[in-house]
């Protein structure tokens, strides 16, 4: 998959890093009417490598069914893949007016917590 | 539920905070054989109140099905409820030897990322 020398898809999908996708402006939930698409960057992927002794024990307890988490609130047994820096997103609304929303798109990611 | 004046159970389960449970040492995944139970503290709960503009748009995109996450790697649209401080846990193994494992239990939580 991909051109010669491209990475296997599974490996590319796994680790915590910056992703980018074309999304409809109207789905950003900003309240602006627009028919355009804009590039949106976000963070996803695993942070398993960054787990602490606490995380390893928490994962073990959850796996063994020895911990009863509060309803609807399962604890997280690894740091979270989250943005560490942001950038503005600009787009054109239906009135052909350019709008800019600060700190809407991620520009860097890290395993936090 | 709870005594007079206590908050409803659902509200108590909701926000990010420190939880505490009695767990079997053998389920901690430490490799020590023990028949003891210890108090294990961990963090869980929602961090929705701490969401950034990025998080709100990410949640909107995911809700609208407008974002196609990498396989097996859904992005997180709120900070994570994670330990900010830890403490050691001590227990007796089957040979009646006291063992101490540093930074195994949480002592404080926060919405990180």
């Amino acid at each position: 998959a991909g051109g010669p020398g491209s990475r296997p898809r599974a490996a590319g999908a796994r680790g915590c890093r910056l992703r980018s996708q074309l999304v409809p402006v109207r789905a950003l939930g900003l309240g602006h009417r627009s028919d355009e698409l804009v590039r949106f960057r976000f963070c996803s992927g695993s942070c398993r490598r960054a787990r602490s002794p606490h995380d390893l024990s928490l994962a073990s307890l959850l796996g063994a069914g020895a911990l009863r988490p509060p309803p609807g609130s399962r604890p997280i047994s690894q740091p979270c893949c989250r943005p560490t820096r942001y950038e503005a997103v600009s787009f054109m609304d239906v009135n052909s007016t350019w709008r800019t929303v600060d700190r809407l798109s991620a520009t860097a990611c890290g395993c936090l917590g | 539920a709870g005594g007079p004046g206590s908050r409803p159970r659902a509200a108590g389960a909701r926000g990010c905070r420190l939880r505490s449970q009695l767990v079997p040492v053998r389920a901690l995944g430490l490799g020590h054989r023990s028949d003891e139970l210890v108090r294990f503290r961990f963090c869980s709960g929602s961090c929705r109140r701490a969401r950034s503009p990025h998080d709100l748009s990410l949640a909107s995109l995911l809700g609208a099905g407008a974002l196609r996450p990498p396989p097996g790697s859904r992005p997180i649209s709120q900070p994570c409820c994670r330990p900010t401080r830890y403490e050691a846990v001590s227990f007796m193994d089957v040979n009646s030897t006291w063992r101490t494992v540093d930074r195994l239990s949480a002592t404080a939580c926060g919405c990180l990322g």
Partner: antibody, heavy 123, light 107 residues
Framework: QVQLVESGGGVVQPGRSLRLSCEAS????????LHWVRQAPGKGLEWVAF????????YYPKSVKGRFSISRDNSKNTLYLQMNSLRAEDTAVYHC????????????????WGQGTLVTVSS | DIQMTQSPSSLSASVGDRVTITCRAS??????LNWYQQKPGKAPKLLIY???GLQSGVPSRFSGRGSGTDFTLAISSLQPEDFATYYC?????????FGPGTKVDIK
């Protein structure tokens, strides 16, 4: 190796329709967003349609919106462009292109292009 | 729409020359700027992706830089096979517009 082969071009009268196809091979078709780009004789490049890897998103510039329709069949590794109400200004070589990166990492850079199929709209 | 302008529209250069082509966007496009090379009768070829990424198989004499609205493509030492037309393209905001092209020919 990656190959994109367009077909379906030809001479057509104004107001008529044409359907272009692009057969893809050498990559996992359903992992990539795809585009059509055209080039009028002696002119520059003009982007005409986008479709997401799963077909959930499509987009067209104003010049073709309402007349052109992009679609894909991931089971056949084929991309299509249905062109209706054709005009003289639609005369161009039409290229099928794939994005360089997987759909979840897409930056919009187009790393493979078909050789193109010529569409001539003339009475 | 985001308008893309390129300068110069054409240039004459000799083998071994350093060549720089400029591309300007009418609105910020962050770093979503790509460069393509096209030879007569051929399909365009991706050279540089997202401002500065060198596409696999492209010689290292090609480089890109810039941010926001102003971008450049540089060829450090022009080779005979580099005589072609070069297009920039923004892929940040729909519609994804191309610059009008810069034709590089032999002096």
């Amino acid at each position: 190796q990656v190959q994109l082969v367009e077909s379906g071009g030809g001479v057509v009268q104004p107001g008529r329709s044409l359907r272009l196809s692009c057969e893809a091979s050498g990559f996992t078709f359903s992992d990539y967003d795809l585009h059509w780009v055209r080039q009028a004789p002696g002119k520059g490049l003009e982007w005409v349609a986008f479709i997401s890897n799963d077909g959930s998103n499509e987009y067209y510039p104003k010049s073709v919106k309402g007349r052109f329709s992009i679609s894909r069949d991931n089971s056949k590794n084929t991309l299509y462009l249905q062109m209706n109400s054709l005009r003289a200004e639609d005369t161009a070589v039409y290229h099928c292109t794939k994005e360089r990166d997987y759909y979840y990492d897409s930056s919009g850079s187009l790393d493979y292009w078909g050789q193109g199929t010529l569409v001539t709209v003339s009475s | 729409d985001i308008q893309m302008t390129q300068s110069p529209s054409s240039l004459s250069a000799s083998v071994g020359d350093r060549v720089t082509i400029t591309c300007r966007a009418s609105q910020t496009i962050n770093n979503y700027l790509n460069w393509y090379q096209q030879k007569p009768g051929k399909a365009p070829k991706l050279l540089i992706y997202t401002t500065s990424g060198l596409q696999s198989g492209v010689p290292s004499r090609f480089s890109g830089r810039g941010s926001g609205t102003d971008f450049t493509l540089a060829i450090s030492s022009l080779q005979p096979e580099d005589f072609a037309t070069y297009y920039c393209q923004q892929s940040y905001h729909s519609p994804f517009t191309f610059g009008p092209g810069t034709k590089v020919d032999i002096k």
